[in-house]
Amino acid sequence: APTSSSTKKTQLQLEHLLLDLQMILNGINNYKNPKLTRMLTFKFYMPKKATELKHLQCLEEELKPLEEVLNLAQSKNFHLRPRDLISNINVIVLELKGSETTFMCEYADETATIVEFLNRWITFCQSIISTLT
């Protein structure tokens, strides 16, 4: 069955979000990154559940801490300045979850490293893309 234009748009937005998150993860995991050990000491809140677009609220709430950690890295591996990168992500997240959403994010008890955090949200995006295909 042909995919609707709204579904296609959602898929593209998720792909863009995925691309940005994977770029950050690649930049952090780069073996030349001398700040990695310090970056891994920062803790991020993980969603208790992330299966729907509304759950992106949990990602949005962690974007400011993410930007702070990326500023620490001062890496050229991200293609964009952290502020611009996070701004891009924020715009996409708002478009995907809808700005009128009043969803209250529930967080898991355990916090995560930046690598675990990024892996979680990349997995989320890929899962939704696969569902929409």
Epitope: L18, L19, M23, L25, Q126, T133
Partner: nanobody, 118 residues
Framework: EVQLLESGGGLVQPGGSLRLSCATS????????MGWYRQAPGKGRELVAV???????NYADSVKGRFTISRDNSKNTMYLQMNSLRAEDTAVYYC????????????WGQGTLVTVSS
């Protein structure tokens, strides 16, 4: 380490066409998602076109009906056919390839400049 190399950029008049190529130095598995994004001076990154391992394509509204993405897995090459080019298409175009399973490796090229001007 896999490397991506874009080619085919250049100066073209409005209404003209260009075909960008993205060749890889190593094996990009056919299951990888590949795509093109662009960055114009002073602007954010815009995802232009995507093609999945299964050949499903998706385009930004700004290029729909004008650009066509394709891939030749046997040649480890991806293409972007750009028709009816406009001044606002001027940007550096980057190709990328990403794993759709952990560890989520991402590869992208150095970019090729496309300038649309009369």
């Amino acid at each position: 380490e896999v490397q991506l190399l874009e080619s085919g950029g250049g100066l073209v008049q409005p209404g003209g066409s260009l075909r960008l190529s993205c060749a890889t130095s190593g094996t990009i598995f056919s299951g990888y998602t590949m795509g093109w994004y662009r960055q114009a001076p002073g602007k954010g990154r815009e995802l232009v076109a995507v093609i999945s391992g299964g050949g499903d394509t998706n385009y930004a509204d700004s290029v729909k009906g004008r650009f066509t993405i394709s891939r030749d897995n046997s040649k480890n090459t991806m293409y972007l056919q750009m028709n009816s080019l406009r001044a606002e298409d001027t940007a550096v175009y980057y190709c990328y390839s990403r794993e759709v399973t952990p560890p989520w490796k991402l590869y992208w090229g150095q970019g090729t400049l496309v300038t649309v001007s009369s």
